[in-house]
Interface confidence: low
């Protein structure tokens, strides 16, 4: 029996809902009383989700599950997941048994944008060219770890001094802190770049110097 | 920066046990699986089991159940393998690695490497 | 256990040549391969992880693909800092699994 599901990861934003596709041919004169639906997590074999004896079994899951009931007779075994978490992310295998059996397992990529950064500068007055200050990139509550790069206002890399740190909170959503140390010239203009790799979705912040004073854009 | 710093070299006699660290930084070690590889000299690399440092919740390959014991102190942020009853086929690179994404079996961030040598 | 071979275990090859290096599992692993960089110090480093993806860091010269049970790494203009020993690992099921690693030398 061939059991399809995609062979891309799927992408599902936190607190989404996200749907695992999967599916098989019936044959001719295929009845639901026939069939034996499990969704496992794929490594440690849990139970997800199952459907027996011509009957939804229910999730398993934290009840965040369903199956398509009107849709299993045509061979859509697909599972939907709610209200998506960073700690769902991973393999989950579909098994499909009629008479024949199979399975196939599809990979659920879990990501969250990240907000837009928040710039500090120390120390942040009576600033001279020469000085050397720490600025601080900072964004928030987003997955998976972020990819960071600081320019000038010329577009040029700053790729010394450069430390990033990425805790992870309760949720597995992670905050990202980005320092890089300068010294400054007559003005310019530091510009920090988060990158969400999977979304490849980019937040920009930066800080303009420029003698005195300093502004700060407003947030966008 | 994340980084995974392993103890040093240890060298031990038949039947003894030894007891070898990884200490991470950079990263919630409480939310990442921590595993141990082993490398025999000149061989391929052996997965012999990972520890989730929140709960302490272990899995071993069946060949290293009752050879390797895996814990976690979550205040130092530090892994350890014990080795017991050690015999020259111990003799190995045994490695610490970071899982990477929640069940997707990839280990993207790797310590140097401890030098285990079991010799009479 | 799923077996992983790479029957491949030296490979010689001249700077900027386009290196392929195979892997193959003994079942279908779904995508779920990785292939990682050991150094000749053994410093061991994620390259690419479920078959194509490129992890942080590894410069673009280096790809993978395959399906089923037949999957390859490909280094592009090959430079002096890849001359390493390359393994590839199933990460489908439970235990993970290495190929025996293929040793990468310069020509």
């Known amino acids: 029996l061939e059991v399809q599901v995609p062979e891309d990861p799927v992408v599902a934003l936190v607190g989404t809902d996200a749907t695992l596709c999967c599916s098989f041919s019936p044959e001719p004169g295929f009845s639901l009383a026939q069939l034996n639906l499990i969704w496992q997590l794929t490594d440690t074999k849990q139970l997800v989700h199952s459907f027996a004896e011509g009957q939804d079994q229910g999730s398993a899951y934290a009840n965040r599950t369903a199956l398509f009931p009107d849709l299993l007779a045509q061979g859509n075994a697909s599972l939907r997941l709610q209200r998506v978490r960073v700690a769902d992310e991973g393999s989950f295998t579909c098994f499909v048994s009629i008479r024949d059996f199979g399975s196939a397992a599809v990979s659920l990529q879990v990501a969250a944008p990240y907000s837009k950064p928040s710039m500090t500068l120390e120390p942040n007055k009576d600033l001279r060219p020469g000085d050397t200050v720490t600025i601080t990139c900072s964004s928030y509550r987003g997955y998976p770890e972020a990819e960071v790069f600081w320019q000038d206002g010329q577009g040029v890399p700053l790729t010394g001094n450069v430390t990033t740190s990425q805790m992870a909170n309760e949720q597995g959503l992670f905050d990202v802190h980005s320092v890089l140390r300068v010294v400054l010239g007559a003005n310019g203009t530091y510009s920090c770049l988060v990158r969400n790799p999977v979304l490849q979705q980019d937040a920009h912040g930066s800080v303009t110097i420029t003698g005195q004073p300093m502004t700060f854009p407003p947030e966008a | 920066q994340v980084q995974l710093q392993q103890s040093g070299a240890e060298l031990a006699r038949p039947g003894a046990s030894v007891k070898l660290s990884c200490k991470a930084s950079?990263?919630?070690?409480?939310?990442?699986?921590m595993q141990w590889v082993k490398q025999r000299p000149g061989q391929g690399l052996e997965w012999i089991g990972t520890i989730y440092p929140g709960d302490g919740d272990t899995r071993y390959t069946q060949k290293f159940k009752g050879k390797a014991t895996l814990t976690a102190d979550k205040s130092s942020s530090t892994a350890y393998m014990q080795l017991s009853s050690l015999a020259s086929e111990d003799s190995a690179v045994y490695y610490c690695?970071?899982?990477?994404?929640?069940?997707?079996?990839?280990?993207?961030?790797w310590g140097a490497g401890t030098t285990v040598t079991v010799s009479s | 256990d799923i077996q992983m071979t790479q029957t491949t275990s030296s490979l010689s090859a001249s700077l900027g040549d386009r290196v392929t290096i195979s892997c193959r599992a003994s079942q279908d692993i779904s995508n779920y391969l990785n292939w990682y960089q050991q150094k000749p110090d053994g410093t061991v480093k994620l390259l690419i992880y479920y078959t194509s993806r490129l992890h942080s860091g590894v410069p673009s010269r280096f790809s993978g693909s395959g399906s089923g049970t037949d999957y390859s790494l490909t280094i592009d203009n090959l430079e002096q800092e890849d001359i390493a020993t390359y393994f590839c690992q199933q990460g489908n099921t439970l235990p993970p699994t290495f190929g025996g690693g293929t040793k990468l030398e310069i020509k």
């Open positions: 690695a970071r899982r990477g994404i929640p069940r997707l079996w990839y280990f993207d961030v």
């Open positions: 950079g990263y919630t070690f409480t939310s990442y699986w």
